[in-house]
């Protein structure tokens, strides 16, 4: 398992929510990506392919997510101060082998301006 801080902008704020960007190498074909808040699994997305090369995308812990050819974005809405925490992208690479797990993360700071419903 490889642990480290994300070397890219992991958090993108918009409209009182946050997009958490979990990147993976272009060469990865099949994988599971989990979003962890502290040690708790918040969201996950698994991409696999069958023997006819058809793609299957599954989520056991569903969040609004978006898949590209080198990242999974998870979206959290209605931000409040309780969202401030360490978030980790836990990537399990199935294909190409060998099987590998990498963990990258960062701290989500919540500022007044990013809150969903500020008191005037």
């Amino acid at each position: 398992e490889i642990n480290g801080s994300a070397n890219y902008e992991m958090f993108i704020f918009h409209n009182g929510g946050v997009q958490i960007l979990c990147k993976y190498p272009d060469i990865v074909q099949q994988f599971k990506m989990q979003l962890l808040k502290g040690g708790q699994i918040l969201c996950d997305l698994t991409k696999t392919k069958g023997s006819g090369n058809k793609v299957s995308i599954k989520s056991l812990k569903f969040c609004h997510s978006q898949l590209s050819n080198n990242s999974v974005s998870f979206f959290l809405y209605n931000l409040d101060r309780s969202h401030a925490n360490y978030y980790f992208c836990n990537l399990s690479i199935f294909d190409p082998p060998p099987f590998k797990v990498t963990l990258t993360g960062g701290y989500l700071h919540i500022y007044e301006s990013q809150l969903c419903c500020q008191l005037k």
């Epitope: 060469i27 696999t48 392919k49 069958g50 058809k54 199935f94 082998p97």
Partner: antibody, heavy 117, light 111 residues
Framework: EVQLVESGGGLVQPGGSLRLSCAAS????????MDWVRQAPGKGLVWVSN????????EYSPFVKGRFTISRDNAKNTLYLQMNSLRAEDTAVYYC??????????WGQGTLVTVSS | DIVMTQSPDSLAVSLGERATINCKSS??????????LTWYQQKPGQPPKLLIF???TRHTGVPDRFSGSGSGTDFTLTISSLQAEDVAVYYC?????????FGPGTKVDIK
């Protein structure tokens, strides 16, 4: 150790039906696509059908489409193949196989289906 | 459907000698960095066994006398030094799209 054990084969008349089962153990069944591959006596390998991890995607060979149905029960770790309108040319050993992401990495011993009057 | 052909149909090789099996696909199996081509070995009375995936990567536990090469439409399985336990039928197989198809097989015997 991964184990796949097929059952349900036998002798059936043309036009008849059979249901094959494959009991899986030694791995997390619900994490893998599964396939059926068949082999007629003395002949080569022919892919029959596959199913994704939760059964929401299925694919079939043109030879069996509309006659065979693949399904799975993840609670029972079991793969099925319902075969209807059987023909003499369906006579074969039917193998249950695990699609291990980039190849059929585990195979059962096979179950023989004979279609004959 | 992609058609897979193999040559020769059969070959007999002396123990310790090299055996070479060719496989050709009717269209390219290359997508991105990967050739979607696998090789299987089937010994008499047994189910097939995965040998090589992505055209050239040996599966876990496969002896290094087995090697795969090729790209696009032309592929080769080589057994560098044939052993008695290598007597089998060898199949190439593609998983580029549906339906995945197998070659007709090449039977390898001891001369």
């Amino acid at each position: 150790e991964v184990q796949l054990v097929e059952s349900g084969g036998g002798l059936v008349q043309p036009g008849g039906s059979l249901r094959l089962s494959c009991a899986a153990s030694g791995f997390t069944f619900s994490d893998y696509w599964m396939d059926w591959v068949r082999q007629a006596p003395g002949k080569g390998l022919v892919w029959v059908s596959n199913i994704d991890e939760d059964g929401s995607i299925t694919e079939y060979s043109p030879f069996v489409k509309g006659r065979f149905t693949i399904s799975r029960d993840n609670a029972k770790n079991t793969l099925y193949l319902q075969m209807n309108s059987l023909r003499a040319e369906d006579t074969a050993v039917y193998y249950c196989t695990r699609w291990g992401r980039f190849g059929f990495d585990s195979w059962g011993q096979g179950t023989l289906v004979t279609v004959s009057s | 459907d992609i058609v897979m052909t193999q040559s020769p149909d059969s070959l007999a090789v002396s123990l310790g000698e090299r055996a070479t099996i060719n496989c050709k696909s009717s269209q390219s199996l290359l997508s991105g960095s990967f050739n979607y081509l696998t090789w299987y070995q089937q010994k008499p009375g047994q189910p097939p066994k995965l040998l090589i995936f992505y055209a050239s990567t040996r599966h876990t536990g496969v002896p290094d006398r087995f090697s795969g090469s090729g790209s696009g439409t032309d592929f080769t399985l080589t057994i560098s030094s044939l052993q008695a336990e290598d007597v089998a039928v060898y199949y190439c197989h593609h998983h580029y799209n549906a339906p995945p198809t197998f070659g007709p097989g090449t039977k390898v015997d001891i001369k």
